[in-house]
């Protein structure tokens, strides 16, 4: 029985050109994490394998950095990065857990109503 839950950073709004950190945390289970995949709309961004370490997809190598931890850092954000990101935890013996984070990237000039953006 799958007892675990995924906690995420929560949805994020950020400015074009900035950086953000996407993070998920698996809790309430003793299952062993064998691999974490980061995906966006059916595109694989990165893999963190317990034995083999990190692999960043070639098309994202310039703008995606591994970590902190099992998280992912997205740099030089563009409006086209707006979308839903998935952290997919492969575990044994539980199976797969998925977390979801929606990222909205805005042009600096169109930040409305005094929206606050935190860019690390």
């Amino acid at each position: 029985m799958m007892t675990g839950t995924i906690e995420t950073t929560g949805n994020i709004s950020a400015e074009k050109g900035g950086s953000i950190i996407l993070q998920c945390h698996l809790s309430s289970t003793t299952a062993q994490v064998t691999q974490v995949n980061w995906e966006q709309q059916d595109q694989l961004l990165a893999i963190c394998n317990a034995d083999l370490g990190w692999h960043i997809s070639p098309s994202f190598k310039d703008r995606v950095a591994p970590g902190p931890g099992l998280g992912l850092t997205l740099q030089s954000l563009t409006v086209n990065d707006t979308g839903e990101y998935f952290c997919i935890y492969h575990t044994y013996p539980d199976g797969t857990y998925t977390g979801r984070i929606f990222l909205e990237v805005l042009e600096s000039s169109v930040a409305e109503h005094g929206a606050r953006f935190q860019i690390p």
């Epitope: 929560g10 909205e104 805005l106 929206a115």
Partner: antibody, heavy 119, light 112 residues
């Protein structure tokens, strides 16, 4: 003036599929997400999902995965929602609503499309 | 999914009253960057829902200042300082911090 004009009421038979439209005007269509929300008779509001007109990306409430498919036509500034294999449980008013940039909220709403599924 | 609980379900009022509606979430609505995505809507019979408050406490354009929002973390409140006839209807809070977005069950503001 921001306006979202939805298609008219529908009476459909169980098992069929249908498409609701939401034509946007008065703003840059590709600069804002478009959400879909439903209210079943006398029940709560439920968020179905959204689409990003700029790149076509979508996000769904898993409850509606396989039931609703959201698309856009940028040329006509129109968002669409396909409702699949309808049952009486899908009878509801469906709203499109523009996303409020930077706040994950909805600022302007369409007038709603009433869908009745009945044999 | 994040569960959002609104209280009370029904709120009988007289015009001129001040009222509060509570909205509680099953987990914190503050993201890792310190932003909290909680909004309030009024749904009048025969109309579409309308945005009142976004980002906990920001009034949307054209919303009278008798409406105010407050709160943090998991506990939020909408206050209406002087009830007018046009304020009657169903009030909903919405959390947009976690996927999927979820609404509270609604509070019906009606005349005593």
């Amino acid at each position: 003036e921001v306006q979202l004009q939805q298609s008219g009421p529908e009476l459909v038979k169980p098992g069929v599929s249908m498409k609701i439209s939401c034509k946007a005007s008065g703003y840059s269509f590709t600069g804002y997400t478009m959400n879909w929300v439903r209210q079943s008779h006398g029940k709560d509001l439920e968020w179905i999902g959204l689409i990003i007109p700029y790149n076509g990306g979508t996000s769904y409430n898993q409850k509606f995965k396989g039931k609703a498919t959201i698309t856009v036509d940028k040329a006509s500034s129109t968002a669409y929602m396909d409702l699949l294999s309808l049952t009486s449980e899908d009878s509801a008013v469906y709203y499109c609503a523009r996303g409020l940039r930077g706040y994950f909220a909805m600022d302007y709403w369409g007038q709603g499309t009433s869908v009745t599924v009945s044999s | 999914d994040v569960v959002v609980t609104q209280t009370p379900l029904s709120l009988p009022v007289s015009f001129g009253d001040q009222v509060s509606i509570s909205c509680r979430s099953s987990q914190s609505l503050t993201n890792s960057y310190g932003n909290t995505y909680l909004s309030w809507y009024l749904h009048k019979p025969g109309q579409s829902p309308q945005l009142l408050i976004y980002g906990i406490s920001n009034r949307f354009s054209g919303v009278p200042d008798r409406f105010s929002g407050s709160g943090s973390g998991t506990d939020f409140t909408l206050k209406i300082s002087t009830i007018k006839p046009e304020d009657l209807g169903m009030y909903y809070c919405l959390q947009g911090t976690h996927q999927p977005w979820t609404f509270g069950g609604g509070t019906k503001l009606e005349i005593k």
